[in-house]
Amino acid sequence: DAHKSEVAHRFKDLGEENFKALVLIAFAQYLQQCPFEDHVKLVNEVTEFAKTCVADESAENCDKSLHTLFGDKLCTVATLRETYGEMADCCAKQEPERNECFLQHKDDNPNLPRLVRPEVDVMCTAFHDNEETFLKKYLYEIARRHPYFYAPELLFFAKRYKAAFTECCQAADKAACLLPKLDELRDEGKASSAKQRLKCASLQKFGERAFKAWAVARLSQRFPKAEFAEVSKLVTDLTKVHTECCHGDLLECADDRADLAKYICENQDSISSKLKECCEKPLLEKSHCIAEVENDEMPADLPSLAADFVESKDVCKNYAEAKDVFLGMFLYEYARRHPDYSVVLLLRLAKTYETTLEKCCAAADPHECYAKVFDEFKPLVEEPQNLIKQNCELFEQLGEYKFQNALLVRYTKKVPQVSTPTLVEVSRNLGKVGSKCCKHPEAKRMPCAEDYLSVVLNQLCVLHEKTPVSDRVTKCCTESLVNRRPCFSALEVDETYVPKEFNAETFTFHADICTLSEKERQIKKQTALVELVKHKPKATKEQLKAVMDDFAAFVEKCCKADDKETCFAEEGKKLVAASQAALGL
């Protein structure tokens, strides 16, 4: 429906609190380097303007689009050129090109300092002194570091963040109460950001059709009792929501997400029996709960798919006359029968089916040609099954840290040109698949593992896109969204890679390593491991293990020494020499 004033419409729908929070998120995701105070000032100005439009929708400028209003506001920032360089050129453009320009300048890896968590008492004091500013700061810091974070979901995180401080700052042991909650929010937040980043990449790099196919498969698994028309409606609405959020239209996105949650709850009888608890919650919790809801039970009496999609001699007629409906129905029917498959596998099967029909429907005897199409699915299903089986066995044998190290070595050998911090981050996340998914029974392992790997490999793709260094990474990232994981799995050692020059500084460590958390210490060691492989790509597992064991012993020894710094200097030289000898450097 057309509204005289879009900004007034959204202000009224969302309420002042959510309106202000979402505008802050939007601005922080666009101008990631701007100080907090500058953003708060801009948000307050926009909010005051919105209120004038609520009072009189015909007031001056109230009829302008949100992109125009927000873009004009962002372009008032005085230090735009100094801080952002060529992004300032966006301001010379007209809408919608200006917004597209801002979107293109979003930085997945902004040069921002690591967020250091203050002492609990310091945080609690800040929370009590000015709760509103404290929570705004949280939104700002997350949004600027995660420019594609799903905005309505960030509101949910902020609500939980506030609840944690409200509860724990009154507790007897504030730290024991608060720190686990903050750790959980941090880990969940990173996972949420990465999942949303894949949705945005899917829409922006592969188009709406790719996202819709993903959504049909996932929703059909989740709501197998829902009929095709219902799933199609949900897919259309969900696509609109994510298109808006990925496009920076955060007010529309949050509003439409609320409408979608309302619709789902009003129609839960025809969608899923698992929604009851979700639908009793307040809005933000409700939307989050629906997004995470477990798969409903498969309906009884589902006949074989072969009859309609393989055995029928009219397959080509149905395909030719109603391509999208026919393929959509195939994906829906296959997915609702296979909660045990990953979404990407289901999409590979659908693509194989489509390719077979394209070929066979032009053949002399189409039915004879496509009669064995389901046989082509067998190797596609077995490949991820076998890979997951092997890797879960390896994980159970090694434990998470050593499993991550095995993946670090594997991926560094595949794509050694990629920066060491990216290889460490991505391989650590790939390694987390073990503890996340291997505990599940067989029927849940593949959807857990392969769909998680898709999210992690997308991190590699977006980070690599910023500064491309490897044609192999570019190829795996751009050729096919659903075949990214098999593409990376199939990569062997890069024989064209010229080993990195040895630099002793890379392997020089200091006493500060002793005060690091276990996680930070692991990252230091894993960074050294990647560098080692880059210097000696042909090193065997045994050689690398020996060096890493020596390294661990060296750190342990020096951290126990009285004069730690001297120990690191002297023993470090010996370790480097011994490692060079062991690896033949």
Epitope: P303, S304, A306
Partner: antibody, heavy 120, light 107 residues
Amino acid sequence: EVQLVESGGGLVQPGGSLRLSCAASGFSLSSYAMNWVRQAPGKCLEWIGHINAGDIAYYATWAKGRFTISRDNSKNTVYLQMNSLRAEDTAVYFCARGAGGFSTGPFKLWGQGTLVTVSS
Amino acid sequence: FELTQSPSSLSASVGDRVTITCQASESINSRLAWYQQKPGQPPKLLIYDASDLTSGVPSRFSGSGSGTDFTLTISSLQPEDFATYYCQGYGGSSTTTFGCGTKLTVL
């Protein structure tokens, strides 16, 4: 409640026309292949045709030309247009839902049927 | 294709084991359904894909066969089982065919 209700049956003269309706409730008709089946008094079940989710209609060989199946998704209703009716078309006409959007069977959901009598 | 059901009528007693057959004029793989119909009612689906029992149907009903020869078995007849039974072949194309029924009556 998920159900199908046929209507539009009655007495018609030979050579006349009749349009039967099948109204669906509790589900969206556009998700399924919707079938028409008839049964002459004391006789076998006879499939007439169906319209699938791609809006493609298929007919039994004997029904082609005289019978037309269509649907209106906004009304959640499927129709059977019958022309040049003969005495042998006298039967109870059932509407039945296919298992999926492109299914010719099996039919788990049936209407109660509407009686068509062709007589002068 | 055509479906030939036999026998066309059958008399039996409560507790009897009853078998009805359906033969297709060409292979229909496992795409055969069995229905039960009582006077003044629409047919009720009992078995689909030759041997899969529809939820809510008593386990005394079972189906078997593939290709061209199919069987419906009622292991121990109950009073409510006296009715007409139809087979239906589907899936080979976008058309479907019914057999002409087997009327099961009390002996």
